[in-house]
């Protein structure tokens, strides 16, 4: 009878991450007596995958009675395949023998490859707020892949961005494979209701790639510009004054109001209005008794918006032109809740 | 059903010969080791001897060179000559099959009786 | 030629009992070593092989444990049908050799 031969009929094997892998080894004899183990990798540092004489493998089960003495195939599944299982697969024949089994054959190897497919992709804007015409840095990171090959794109409202670097890690072989990429975006005053998608293709996901979002609302800071005017004339001796507060985001904004360099009145937006554009409007105003004043006064506008320094604009009341009435230093009462009097 | 059955055992004189034979059924008798034990009567067992599955031969000392084990896969039996016969050799003898893969057996047949007396 | 040598050659035990039976090699037989049970007139059944393998069909009561040169044959709960002779065999290398045997008796 000829020498035993092990064949592993199939040179390379690939599976999804979570399914099965089917091994394939058969004997061409029935002798010599002695058992088949199966190992990963070859040469000393090998690892024990099965061993039909003892030990427990929970993830392994026969593909055919290995207990009988007439069996030849020695194939093995192995469950709930992770990429950590990446590997060469040997089935190699030994003879029984004592103190050891001696190793008799073995199989050239069966390649295990692992396709896994990349988490969500996770995208993460810069830590503080910046201003249109600024450019800021978006990343995007995903893991757990294999193989190695991997597509990744930026869109900014669906059109795709040029301006990005990626790198997949590591470099050499891996049981597994991680990717990140930062993509540089201009931002736009109509960028509150943008969108940065980072989206993700791999064979794993059978041409329904992966997307990770980021939105620019949380990115974006837009300052708001502002209009000091005065209204007509409500009554003889009073004059109403606006501070428009317009195209700003986000809405936490504070306004104060200064006359003559003195805070007359300090606000916070509320009632805001918001525009197409995701921006918002806000509209100041104040009462201004003229008859209280004997100089022209000098009204000032002063937002804080989002933290940054206070912008502000003025506003020169003309008192000349309004005669004032003898002995009278009371201001008009208050008709709404961010109307106020000057003295 | 897997089954083994002896038969050929009987009484002979010291010097005599017997020819015991091993009929298998229930599987492919071919891939399989076969074996001989012996036990005497109240007395253990003993293992007698072997033929591989492709032809080859071991036996206890007690018997080299007297017995011959032999195999008929056409036929599915096993076969044991014993020349020169003692009276040490009587026993009852039982085929058993290498069942296991390491060649542990796992079927014996219900064994044949040999005597050996004048 | 390797030596077996089994102990006790005689047990006494009652019905739910639990009992080991020893068996020692002569030499290191790796865990080739086999445990047979037989009851009188009838041809030994194997119970255990590979020193820790439970042959088919054996019920779980029965467990072998041991490699190299020392081997236990262990029966957790004994019922009437186990009172019988058990052997062990060391199958690693030719001749084949057994032990002399326990006889498991009922108290």
């Known amino acids: 009878e000829e020498e035993l031969q092990v064949i592993q009929p199939d040179k390379s094997v690939l599976v999804a991450a979570g399914e099965t892998a089917t091994l394939r080894c058969t004997a061409t004899s029935l002798i010599p007596v002695g058992p088949i183990q199966w190992f990963r990798g070859a040469g000393p540092g090998r690892e024990l995958i099965y061993n039909q004489k003892e030990g427990h493998f929970p993830r392994v089960t026969t593909v055919s009675d290995l207990t009988k003495r007439n069996n030849m195939d020695f194939s093995i599944r192995i469950g709930n395949i992770t990429p950590a299982d990446a590997g060469t697969y040997y089935c190699v024949k030994f003879r029984k023998g004592s103190p050891d089994d001696v190793e008799f054959k073995s199989g050239a190897g069966t390649e295990l490859s692992v396709r896994a497919k990349p988490s969500a992709p996770v995208v993460s804007g810069p830590a503080a707020r910046a201003t249109p015409q600024h450019t800021v840095s978006f990343t995007c990171e995903s893991h757990g892949f294999s193989p190695r090959d991997i597509t990744l794109k930026w869109f900014k409202n669906g059109n795709e961005l040029s301006d990005f670097q990626t790198n997949v890690d590591p470099v050499g072989e891996s049981v597994s494979y991680s990717i990140h990429s930062t993509a540089k975006v201009v931002l736009t005053r109509e960028d509150v209701h943008s969108q940065v998608i980072c989206e993700v293709a791999h064979v794993t996901l059978q041409g329904d790639p992966l997307r990770g979002t980021a939105n620019l609302s949380e990115t974006i800071r837009v300052p708001p510009t502002l209009e000091v005017t005065q209204q007509p004339v409500r009554a003889e001796n009073q004059v109403n004054v606006t501070c428009q507060v317009r195209k700003f985001y986000p809405q936490r904004l504070q306004l104060t109001w200064l006359e003559n360099g003195n805070v007359s009145r300090t606000e916070t937006a509320s009632t805001v209005t918001e525009n197409k554009d995701g921006t918002y409007n806000w509209m100041s105003w104040l009462l201004v008794n003229v008859s209280a004043h004997r100089d022209d006064v000098k009204l000032t506008c002063q937002v804080e918006h989002d933290g940054q320094p206070a912008v502000s604009k003025s506003h020169d009341l003309k008192v000349s032109a309004h005669p004032k009435e003898q002995g009278s230093n009371t201001a008009a009462e208050n008709t709404g809740s961010n109307e106020r009097n000057i003295y | 059903e897997v089954q083994l059955v002896e038969s050929g055992g009987g009484l002979v004189q010291p010097g005599g010969s017997l020819r015991l034979s091993c009929a298998a059924s229930?599987?492919?008798?071919?891939?399989?080791?076969m074996h001989w034990v012996r036990q005497t009567t109240g007395k253990g067992l003993e293992w007698v001897s072997v033929i591989g599955i492709a032809g080859d031969t071991y036996y206890a000392g007690s018997v080299k060179g007297r017995f011959t084990i032999s195999r008929e896969n056409a036929k599915s039996s096993l076969y044991l000559q014993m020349n020169s016969l003692r009276a040490g050799d009587t026993a009852v003898y039982y085929c058993?099959?290498?069942?296991?893969?390491?060649?542990?057996?796992?079927?014996w047949g219900q064994g044949t009786m040999v005597t050996v007396s004048s | 030629d390797i030596q077996m040598t089994q102990s006790p050659s005689s047990l006494s035990a009652s019905v739910g009992d639990r009992v080991t039976i020893t068996c020692r090699a002569s030499?290191?037989?790796?865990?080739?070593l086999a445990w047979f049970q037989q009851k009188p007139g009838k041809a030994p059944k194997s119970q255990i092989y590979?020193?820790?393998s439970l042959q088919s069909g054996v019920p779980s009561k029965f467990s072998g444990s041991g490699s190299g040169t020392d081997f236990t044959l262990t029966i957790s709960s004994l019922q009437p049908e186990d009172f019988a002779t058990y052997y062990c065999q060391q199958y690693s290398t030719y001749p084949y050799t057994f032990g002399q045997g326990t006889k498991l008796e009922i108290k």
């Open positions: 030499q290191d037989i790796n865990n080739y």
């Open positions: 590979t020193a820790s």
């Open positions: 058993a099959r290498g069942g296991n893969w390491d060649d542990a057996f796992d079927i």
């Open positions: 229930g599987f492919t008798f071919s891939s399989y080791d």
